[in-house]
């Protein structure tokens, strides 16, 4: 079965800067990736970025740079200040829509013990089926 992994990293240089990396472990063709924070997309989460393999990338603050790393993984840099700034226990979710598998989503956050500059290992953490 397909899996989605999520890795969250706080940058040592800027404590309000986070990098989220997500990947899809499956054989299908990815048609869309949606990154949200504060919970899963469509379930109270706020959309930060949408990445389509051919149609382009859209992002909204505090997202600063979303990009494809490979054909099955993406990264997103967040920078915030004040109300729009992510904090250490913020949950980030990545939802991959793929054919023929359907939609798969996983969420992750910084581990409580993380030092700046360290990251959580990529986790296929709670995988939610959302066909």
């Amino acid at each position: 079965t397909p899996e989605v992994w999520v890795q969250v990293r706080m940058e040592a240089t800027e404590l309000s800067s986070f990098t989220i990396r997500c990947g899809f472990l499956g054989s299908g063709s990815i048609s869309l990736v949606t990154v949200s924070w504060g919970g899963p997309n469509g379930a109270g989460g706020t959309t930060l970025a949408v990445l389509h393999p051919e149609r382009g990338i859209r992002q909204w603050a505090p997202a600063r740079q979303a990009r494809w790393e490979t054909q099955s993984s993406i990264s997103l840099i967040l920078e915030g200040s004040g109300a729009s700034s992510p904090c250490a226990n913020t949950t980030f979710c990545c939802k991959f829509a793929s054919f023929p598998e359907g939609s798969w989503e996983a969420c992750g956050s910084l581990p409580p013990s993380s030092d700046p500059g360290l990251s959580a290992p990529p986790t296929p953490a709670p995988i939610l089926r959302a066909d």
């Epitope: 706020t46 959309t47 909204w60």
Partner: antibody
Framework: QVQLQQPGAELVKAGASVKMSCKAS????????ITWVKQRPGQGLEWIGD????????NYNEKFKNKATLTVDTSSSTAYMQLSSLTSEDSAVYYC???????WGQGTTLTVSS | DIVMTQSPSSLSVSAGEKVTMSCKSS????????????LAWYQQKPGQPPKLLIY???TRESGVPDRFTGSGSGTDFTLTISSVQAEDLAVYYC?????????FGAGTKLELR
């Protein structure tokens, strides 16, 4: 079917503001972003900005940052664009479009009178 | 901002002719991570909103006739109409879908000779 409904025309005096609407139907409003595009008579297309319902941080073309304000009302599935301190340069057709530009409104023709 | 330059600004054609128009971007529209070009082409007829024809530089939008073909990579792109029909007379715009702001070219107007 997917529809983006825009008022056909707005006539506003120079120096005033206008708030134009784009009412979406036929799809889940909170699942797609709305982009606004300007077209002056006989001219090309200018990208103004986009907004995702539920995210209060629109993207703006720097050129329109002090001119346009994008908002949404999820309860009525309507996107709004307010244009301030209007001049004759703002007279144009303004389109709203969904997501990756697959559906467009018919456009609102803004005429700024002196 | 990425500047999109289209040429020619207008083209006079006869029905059945093959036509090509060019679009050049001031920066590469190639996404290195997945090797996709983020460029779109639109068709606009008088009094109508633009219609998406091509995305990803070469993928036809659903319902677009196969006489429309997009090609190119990096900074140089082309839209080809293999056999122009009367209903194809319109203005064609290319758009940078790579980075904000999503700038458009000035357009190529297709006219009947």
């Amino acid at each position: 079917q997917v529809q983006l409904q825009q008022p056909g025309a707005e006539l506003v005096k120079a120096g005033a503001s206008v708030k134009m609407s784009c009412k979406a139907s036929g799809y889940t409003f909170t699942s797609y972003w709305i982009t606004w595009v300007k077209q002056r008579p006989g001219q090309g297309l200018e990208w103004i900005g986009d907004i995702y319902p539920g995210n209060d941080s629109p993207n703006y073309n720097e050129k329109f940052k002090n001119k346009a304000t994008l908002t949404v009302d999820t309860s009525s599935s309507t996107a709004y664009m307010q244009l301030s301190s209007l001049t004759s340069e703002d007279s144009a057709v303004y389109y709203c479009t969904r997501g990756y530009y697959d559906y467009w409104g018919q456009g609102t023709t803004l005429t700024v009178s002196s | 901002d990425i500047v999109m330059t289209q040429s020619p600004s207008s083209l006079s054609v006869s029905a059945g002719e093959k036509v090509t128009m060019s679009c050049k971007s001031s920066q590469s529209l190639l996404n290195s991570g997945n090797q996709k070009n983020y460029l779109a082409w639109y068709q606009q007829k008088p009094g109508q909103p633009p219609k998406l024809l091509i995305y990803g530089a070469s993928t036809r939008e659903s319902g677009v006739p196969d006489r429309f073909t997009g090609s190119g990579s990096g900074t140089d792109f082309t839209l080809t109409i293999s056999s122009v029909q009367a209903e194809d007379l319109a203005v064609y715009y290319c758009q940078n879908d790579h980075s904000y702001p999503h700038t458009f070219g000035a357009g190529t107007k297709l006219e009947l000779r």
